[in-house]
């Protein structure tokens, strides 16, 4: 039994780090493998993660953490019974993938303005809470070419756009994702999408 693709890990900078790797053949990850992780710090102890299958030879492990600060560094040991398959380390602050925003809502009752709001996925005491920026994706269900991205570079989790920038009388969907420049994070996963019917009063033409 050998590791084909070494574990790579990302942290949500809150309570979970996710590590993925591939074995050299079909593996029952949960029964054959264990990933031990330990914070490099005085009096810390090793903790065990039981991996799950992620495709035939792929494994994924969700490492539970109490919280994360920038200095944290973890040792990782991948075991198959008594055999050490791989040894490495992981610094969560250098491999951050933020949590996806939630509760995306489209408010269509504000005259001819669309107000999109969503929730910051972090509690106020988390460092990322005040450092997230967002990308909002809006697309038409009817027209694959009608696909647009709005970058929200301010902290407030909301976006206002004129309803008239979209076509009237058709359905749109929106989703949002987040990233944090301070830790040069990857983008989060997209939030679940929300659907609405876009309609607005066309302005009377002046002759």
């Amino acid at each position: 039994m050998k590791v084909l693709q070494e574990p790579t890990c990302v942290s949500d900078y809150m309570s979970i780090s996710t590590c993925e790797w591939k074995m050299n053949g079909p593996t029952n990850c949960s029964t054959e493998l264990r990933l031990l992780y330990q914070l490099v710090f005085l009096l810390s102890e090793a903790h065990t993660c039981i991996p799950e299958n992620n495709g035939g030879a792929g494994c994924v492990c969700h490492l539970l953490m109490d919280d994360v600060v920038s200095a944290d560094n973890y040792t990782l040991d991948l075991w198959a019974g008594q055999q050490l398959l791989w040894k490495g380390s992981f610094k969560p602050s250098e491999h951050v993938k933020p949590r996806a925003p939630g509760n995306l809502t489209v408010h269509t009752n504000v005259s001819d303005t669309l107000l999109l709001t969503w929730s910051n996925p972090y509690p106020p005491d988390n460092y990322l809470y005040n450092h997230l920026t967002y990308a909002v994706n809006i697309w038409s269900e009817n027209d694959p070419a009608d696909f647009r991205i709005y970058n929200v570079t301010y902290l407030e989790p909301s976006l206002r756009i004129a309803a008239s920038t979209l076509k009237s009388g058709i359905s749109y969907r929106a989703r949002v994702r987040a990233w944090a420049q301070c830790y040069n994070t990857t983008w989060s996963e997209w939030s679940p999408s929300t659907k609405w019917h876009n309609s607005y009063r066309e302005p009377f033409e002046q002759h």
Epitope: L43, S44, E45, A46, L64, M65, D66, V69
Partner: antibody
């Protein structure tokens, strides 16, 4: 009530051995690291040794390394300090103290928040 | 080893007056944001030490709010807003960022 009670101190000749015990109660003993601190007569506090909750990690002051052994029996909620090759400079009051929570991934630290009453070790010929 | 230096070593105070003790470390005790591994302990005559402040500024359970801790990195301070007669004893700072844990020499607080 969270409590630590030391025992095992006494008078011992140089080169001799003693085993100190510290019985914990009122908290989940195995979840916490434990620490020994000593105080020579008329002197300040000196750290001696620490051990993690499971006992897998141990740490010693240079002055006792190779002579003292810290251990624990979590089934008995008891911490130990085996003291061998005793020297006159080991004469002190020995305190055990409750250290950080090591059951968590990050050892949660709340200071040495509970101390025993101390047990006196005298090394003299 | 990290060396801890306290000042003053003796502190005579009138009851009701404030008191302040300084503690300096030879290396930073800041592990990361919000985690300064510096504690303050009080040892009254004939008693075991008792925890006053942990992680530089967190008051331990049951400690009166006249005690406060501050500082970060290498410079720390323990303040008593209004000294009471029961506050007499030796005050020690201690670092627990790394082993060996090291203590300051101790500050003897006495009533004038």
């Amino acid at each position: 009530e969270v409590q630590l009670v030391e025992s095992g101190g006494g008078l011992e000749q140089p080169g001799g051995s003693l085993r100190l015990s510290c019985a914990g109660s009122g908290f989940t003993f195995r979840d916490y690291a434990m620490t020994w601190v000593r105080q020579a007569p008329g002197k300040g506090l000196e750290w001696v040794s620490s051990i993690s909750g499971s006992g897998s990690n141990t740490y010693y002051a240079d002055s006792v390394k190779g002579r003292f052994t810290i251990s624990r029996d979590n089934s008995k909620n008891t911490l130990y300090l085996q003291m061998n090759s005793l020297r006159a400079e080991d004469t002190a009051v020995y305190y055990c103290a409750k250290d950080r929570l090591t059951a968590s991934v990050r050892p949660n630290y709340y200071g040495l928040d509970v101390w025993g009453q101390g047990t006196t070790v005298t090394v003299s010929s | 080893d990290i060396v801890m230096t306290q000042s003053p070593l003796s502190l005579p105070v009138t009851p009701g007056e404030p008191a302040s003790i300084s503690c300096r470390s030879s290396q930073s005790l800041l592990y990361s944001e919000g985690y300064n591994y510096l504690d303050w302990y009080l040892q009254k005559s004939g008693q075991s030490p008792q925890l006053l402040i942990y992680l530089a500024s967190n008051r331990a359970s049951g400690v009166p709010d006249r005690f406060s801790g501050s500082g970060s990195g290498t410079d720390f301070t323990l303040k008593i807003s209004r000294v009471e007669a029961e506050d007499v004893g030796f005050y020690y700072c201690m670092q627990s960022l790394t082993t060996p844990y090291t203590f300051g020499q101790g500050t003897k607080l006495e009533i004038k």
